[in-house]
Amino acid sequence: HTAAQDNCTCPTNKMTVCSPDGPGGRCQCRALGSGMAVDCSTLTSKCLLLKARMSAPKNARTLVRPSEHALVDNDGLYDPDCDPEGRFKARQCNQTSVCWCVNSVGVRRTDKGDLSLRCDELVRTHHILIDLRHRPTAGAFNHSDLDAELRRLFRERYRLHPKFVAAVHYEQPTIQIELRQNTSQKAAGDVDIGDAAYYFERDIKGESLFQGRGGLDLRVRGEPLQVERTLIYYLDEIPPKFSMKRLT
């Protein structure tokens, strides 16, 4: 697994322990919490990152209206169960035997139940809407410049194939980034949109997962983009199953 050979670190995941004990003395990095080997040439899965985090001390309107089935991650942090590939297991349970089903980005998509709860498959999140509100600037951003800068960011920093950035919408001061990736579209080696969105979220919150700097400060044609708030909506290939009680 590619890691910085000289000082044996993982450029794409600071929440790792690395040592030159791979084949031929190569640098190998393992995720904190799970101890799973990670590929440092790409993004680490969100499931392994959450596990590591828990183990660490401490006009016509161009904006998209999230669908009624869109999920927001209101449950926050938990210590997830990951499969051997580092993906979320469909069923997650806590220490008190409360269980629930999650989607491929680890967001709860059913009511909570007990150990008898069945989650037949891991439902894929195929559409992610990242909703940002920026602080006042010297003037509105040029839409095409903003579009180009955000596409460049997802391509270069998060290694996400450009075809998965479906659209960038802008209606000052709201920016929306749409990521779309169906099961059939995702080839081996492609970064998952859920992982890219998670890295982006952590960057915006000043908690970069990359080695080095603490956060991400965006500029569009030199203009500082200071984010005021971020909301992320997740849409699954199969709508979530919540009781009417929760919906009211």
């Epitope: 602080r135 600037t137 010297a138 003037g139 915006i204 919150k205 000043g206 908690e207 970069s208 700097r213 603490g214 956060g215 400060d217 500029r219 044609r221 030199g222 203009e223 500082p224 200071q226 005021e228």
Partner: antibody
Framework: QVQLVQSGAEVKKPGASVKVSCKAS????????IHWVRQAPGQRLEWMGY????????KYNEKFKGRVTITRDTSASTAYMELSSLRSEDTAVYYC????????????WGQGTLVTVSS | DIQMTQSPSSLSASVGDRVTITCKAS??????LAWYQQKPGKAPKLLIS???SLETGVPSRFSGSGSGKDYTLTISSLQPEDFATYYC????????FGQGTKVEIK
């Protein structure tokens, strides 16, 4: 190497205006905004505003709005800060600064221009 | 506006001492914090940005930590050239500075 060179010290009377220049070199002038920050004697640093040389857009600290005007001459790679209706409290060292290449912190600073307001 | 409160406003220390300066923001600034060193008659010099990232050429005795509203600058072993005034600055919502901490020779 990146350099910001400011104009010399000024002495002004209350009510007058002052215009300070900041010449940038060692990088593409239109790539970064230019901030203006001032420091009155014994006081903290105070952000006044910035100009984006790429499109002439400006953003000001509310405290100085109406009194400060930041402009630029792209052909001369120079930014200017003009402060009007001067009062004695405006006696300070005025700095121009350029952001860090990766963050919005201020990495490169001019040497400072002392503006004294006195009758 | 976000207010930045630095403490102490001044401190006396000897060469070799460990020095800690704290900075508290009036709201969460999500690690958008920089530390500057300023010597008399000179412009500020950027030491740390992103709360923890040391700038190129800055000695490793300087370190930054913290998150949310609370941040710290530590000088592990004070050197003669470190006697100066230190400022914190937030850049999460426009730009504001702390009032400064003057580090003097004991």
């Amino acid at each position: 190497q990146v350099q910001l060179v400011q104009s010399g010290a000024e002495v002004k009377k209350p009510g007058a205006s002052v215009k300070v220049s900041c010449k940038a070199s060692g990088y593409t002038f239109t790539t970064y905004v230019i901030h203006w920050v001032r420091q009155a004697p014994g006081q903290r640093l105070e952000w006044m505003g910035y100009i984006n040389p790429n499109n002439d857009g400006t953003k000001y600290n509310e405290k100085f709005k109406g009194r400060v005007t930041i402009t630029r001459d792209t052909s001369a790679s120079t930014a200017y800060m003009e402060l009007s209706s001067l009062r004695s409290e405006d006696t300070a060292v005025y700095y121009c600064a350029r952001p860090h290449f990766e963050t919005h912190a201020m990495d490169y600073w001019g040497q400072g221009t002392l503006v004294t307001v006195s009758s | 506006d976000i207010q930045m409160t630095q403490s102490p406003s001044s401190l006396s220390a000897s060469v070799g001492d460990r020095v800690t300066i704290t900075c508290k923001a009036s709201e969460d600034i999500f690690n958008r914090l920089a530390w500057y060193q300023q010597k008399p008659g000179k412009a500020p010099k950027l030491l740390i940005s992103g709360a923890t990232s040391l700038e190129t050429g800055v000695p490793s005795r300087f370190s930054g930590s913290g998150s949310g509203k609370d941040y710290t600058l530590t000088i592990s072993s004070l050197q003669p050239e470190d006697f100066a005034t230190y400022y914190c600055q937030q850049y999460w919502n426009t730009w504001t500075f702390g009032q400064g901490t003057k580090v003097e020779i004991k």
